[in-house]
């Protein structure tokens, strides 16, 4: 091959952790040169020589040669960041070349130390135990020591320290994190022992204390919502259920929810507590079934909530609204529009419920005497009638396939409302029906048993 000068490439370590050793290695690759006669030299940015270099024998590849040279630099010099690069110089009969080889930027960053303490109800087992978690984050280089102290004395057992991990970052210097956990007894924690997470990094010590005395009392933000029974739930389940929703509980073990009657008499209350929410709070529900006649009489029912975070019980009282005028709904069943059927895709049947009061209404669709899956229809929330103050309207839309409709299948819209004589009315439509068919039916008990 013909004689040619080398092409130079910088060689820098991919692993950005030169702090692990006392020196940092960078290199220079010379490629495609001929003849095999090459001399490497290295200089700092200020042109002073670098002595600690190491050359590697040249290699013949495709009729031309390649060779590399490595330089070792003290870590501490690199980490001070005075030089962004060093210079690789090459002498060759066909021309001298030089290349800037960047130095890895090594930031020396201190750790941020945080200790996470268990919640009040976070102790389990016998004896009851939990964990303190110490997290050191954002530090560099990666060498670090984590230890635990109790009342200033080193803790020997119950400590687990994970491996140091690089933190996920898109740019900037590589930083690290480490987690250490200490298993503690509830008796020690509640006894107000002072626990300390000690982190040693680059000759400096960082400490974070944890004690049950130091856990701030959160502002009491517990909220109570008393939810009355809906007509739909009474109609469907044949029970009148009062619901008391309690939210923003810091702990669940000390909550009590009770319903009482107007005369102070207790009502049997069934309490359910949620799993912990993402914001580390709990919610609880206290449900009580009552006699429908007691509810309809207008009697007041009170939900009382007690909790250790509450200086005094929270109470919410509800009763059935008085003086609400009863107006029975008019129900109209509208078959699919001819234009829609011409598209041969789906058929939309609309049940229009108008002029009712109060707003509580229940709509269900049936086919061949069986309730249809609620996924097949959409029922709007009751809305005020524009021309009739105090009255409401709603609509329910059932979608079936065009084929189903054309088979002559019948569809029934069942509407339940407390102002209806039998609490329920229905309308039926099929392909042969021009308008809507009315049927104020009695005896729907069997329907609601399903």
């Amino acid at each position: 091959g013909s004689a040619s000068a080398p092409t130079l490439f910088p060689l820098v370590s991919c692993e950005n952790s030169p702090s692990d050793t006392s020196s940092v290695a960078v290199g220079c690759l010379a490629q495609d040169f001929l003849p095999d006669s090459i001399t490497f030299s290295w200089k700092y940015k200020n042109n002073s020589d670098i002595s600690s270099t190491r050359g590697f024998p040249s290699v013949l590849r495709g009729g031309k040669y390649a060779a590399t040279s490595q330089v070792l630099l003290p870590s501490k010099d690199v980490m001070q960041g005075t030089d962004e690069h060093v210079v690789c110089k090459v002498q060759h009969p066909n021309g001298n070349k030089e290349k800037n080889v960047p130095l890895p930027v090594i930031a020396e960053l201190p750790p941020k130390v945080s200790v996470f303490v268990p919640p009040r109800d976070g102790f389990f087992g016998n004896p009851r135990k939990s964990k303190l978690i110490c997290q050191a984050t954002g530090f560099s280089p990666r060498q670090i020591q984590v230890s635990w102290l109790r009342e200033g004395k080193q803790v020997g057992s119950g400590v687990t320290t994970d491996q140091v991990q690089a933190e996920a970052k898109e740019s900037g210097p590589t930083t690290y994190k480490v987690t250490s956990t200490l298993t503690i007894k509830e008796s020690d924690w509640l006894g107000q022992s002072m626990f300390t997470c000690r982190v040693d990094h680059r000759g400096l010590t960082f400490q974070q204390n944890a004690s049950s005395m130091c856990v701030p009392d959160q502002d009491t933000a517990i909220r109570v919502f008393a939810i009355p029974p809906s007509f739909a739930s009474i109609f469907l389940t044949k029970s009148t259920k009062l619901t008391c929703l309690v939210t923003d509980l810091t702990t669940y073990d000390s909550v009590t929810i009770s319903w009482t009657r107007q005369n102070g008499e207790a009502v049997k209350t069934h309490t359910n507590i949620s799993e912990s929410h993402p914001n580390a709070t709990f919610s609880a529900v206290g449900e009580a079934s009552i006699c429908e006649d007691d509810w309809n009489s207008g009697e007041r029912f009170t939900c009382t909530v007690t909790h250790t975070d509450l200086p005094s019980p929270l109470k919410q009282t509800i009763s059935r609204p008085k003086g609400v005028a009863l107006h029975r709904p008019d129900v109209y069943l509208l078959p699919p529009a001819r234009e829609q059927l011409n598209l041969r895709e789906s058929a939309t049947i609309t049940c229009l419920v108008t002029g009712f009061s109060p707003a509580d209404v229940f709509v269900q669709w049936m086919q061949r005497g069986q309730p249809l899956s609620p996924e097949k229809y959409v029922t709007s929330a009751p809305m005020p009638e524009p021309q009739a103050p105090g009255r409401y309207f709603a609509h329910s839309i059932l979608t079936v396939s065009e084929e189903e409709w054309n088979t002559g299948e019948t569809y029934t819209c069942v509407v339940a409302h407390e102002a209806l004589p039998n609490r329920v009315t229905e309308r039926t439509v099929d392909k042969s029906t021009e308008g809507e068919v009315s049927a104020d039916e009695e005896g729907f008990e069997n329907l609601w048993a399903t």
């Epitope: 009770s258 207790a266 009502v267 069934h270 449900e287």
Partner: antibody
Framework: EVQLLESGGGLVQPGGSLRLSCAAS????????MNWVRQAPGKGLEWVSV???????YYADSVEGRFTISRDNSKNTLYLQMNSLRAEDTAVYYC??????????????WGQGTLVTVSS | QSVLTQPPSASGTPGQRVTISCSGS????????VNWYQQLPGTAPKLLIY???QRPSGVPDRFSGSKSGTSASLAISGLRSEDEADYYC???????????FGGGTKLTVL
Amino acid sequence: EVQLLESGGGLVQPGGSLRLSCAASGFTFGSYEMNWVRQAPGKGLEWVSVIYSGGSTYYADSVEGRFTISRDNSKNTLYLQMNSLRAEDTAVYYCARDTNPYYYYGMDVWGQGTLVTVSS
Amino acid sequence: QSVLTQPPSASGTPGQRVTISCSGSSSNIGNNAVNWYQQLPGTAPKLLIYRNNQRPSGVPDRFSGSKSGTSASLAISGLRSEDEADYYCQSYDSSLNGQVFGGGTKLTVL
């Protein structure tokens, strides 16, 4: 005929365990709250535990953490699992049905009782 | 020590009227219904009065109940020898989340 029939009593050593059963008949068992009430020899009645039709359970302070009430509506049976038994748990144990599904209006149906003796 | 307080014993002659008292607090009798039970020797308790003054079917009208404030009482008129039994008052205690009984009153018909 509405009936409750307890079983499972007997002699047990302190620290031991016992499981009482109460078979119900003649009524819709799953719709009622069910209680266990005990009576130590020569002493008065003491309420032990209740299980609501919805599944909620409550216990007297004297048995909290040691006794567990449960029910199997498909078998019309009420249970009381008693652990870490003490001499003072010696009593006749009755199961009893709540009168009213909504309010605390007493217990209208009682079993004949089963004797639990805790002694070494 | 029972949460509800009853006299340990009471007595009367046949035909007489006898009253048994039961006192409690606002967390039980004060706000909740009082129920009464009769326990004949060697048998299970039987509900005698519920919701302060209601009689289950089959209970003679000689038995009556009343409640005032945090106290209640059971009255038996026209006392009979078969009324000789232990009588217990019972209520729900809202602070304890459970039923509470009185210590029982042993009625002797002389």
